[in-house]
Amino acid sequence: ITQQDLAPQQRVAPQQKRSSPSEGLCPPGHHISEDGRDCISCKYGQDYSTHWNDLLFCLRCTRCDSGEVELSPCTTTRNTVCQCEEGTFREEDSPEMCRKCRTGCPRGMVKVGDCTPWSDIECVHKESGTKHSGEAPAVEETVTSSPGTPASPCS
């Protein structure tokens, strides 16, 4: 749907341009007006919508927390993309936190995967090759690799 500006005397703020809904839905980057007659644009850098919708309000842009880096900014059609800083990762089980990667594997295990923003280091038993997951081992048990950075809460 092409966005059409209203007549100058009716025009709203630049970030609030209006168009008409198509079959009751507004395009990405917009939300629907209270009376359902208009599509109102989201505010760049503040909120967004990603799909055709009948939402009364655009969604708030995520703000990257300390301990995260911003990979891409929020636009009217896409949320901010944040990533854990080097040496930390975000688990599926606790997506609100960037956790510190382990610095090494327990005794009798060997590292087969590095710390990434999405996963801790991966350790396997030397003999069996089976994976190990769990808490960071005690210092005296570790075979050190690259050091991690402190974890910070993530939004």
Partner: nanobody, 124 residues
Framework: EVQLVESGGGLVQAGGSLRLSCAAS????????MGWFRQAPGKEREFVAA????????YYVDSVKGRFTISRDNAKNTVYLQMNSLKPEDTAVYYC?????????????????WGKGTLVTVSS
């Protein structure tokens, strides 16, 4: 995760006023749109009012326009519903809800959280 607790309900005479509060726990309160819904005895739950994450945009169902006002204080993690010129037909349990947004029909979008409700009774 957000926990919501409503308060401020009670018995009031027609024409009177009440102010409902909804206190939220959780540091992400300001990320959510907030809504008030109500359910009268034997009836479906009804969308009453909502406002966006900043408080800058509001929505009201026609039956409460000009009488009810929704507002929020992000510093206090609280959303309010000021109800004036109450009518017997406003009698219901009032629920507070948090979601990414709400559809025109009141359907929550994204993760949604609900309080247990507070009873408002308007006598004639």
């Amino acid at each position: 995760e957000v926990q919501l607790v409503e308060s401020g309900g009670g018995l009031v005479q027609a024409g009177g006023s009440l102010r409902l509060s909804c206190a939220a726990s959780g540091r992400t309160f300001s990320n959510y749109a907030m809504g008030w819904f109500r359910q009268a005895p034997g009836k479906e739950r009804e969308f009453v009012a909502a406002l966006n994450w900043s408080g800058g945009s509001t929505y009201y169902v026609d039956s409460v326009k000009g009488r009810f006002t929704i507002s929020r204080d992000n510093a206090k993690n609280t959303v309010y519903l000021q109800m004036n010129s109450l009518k017997p037909e406003d009698t219901a349990v009032y629920y507070c809800a948090a979601a990414g947004s709400f559809s025109l029909g009141g359907r929550p979008y994204g993760d949604d959280y609900w309080g247990k409700g507070t009873l408002v009774t308007v006598s004639s």
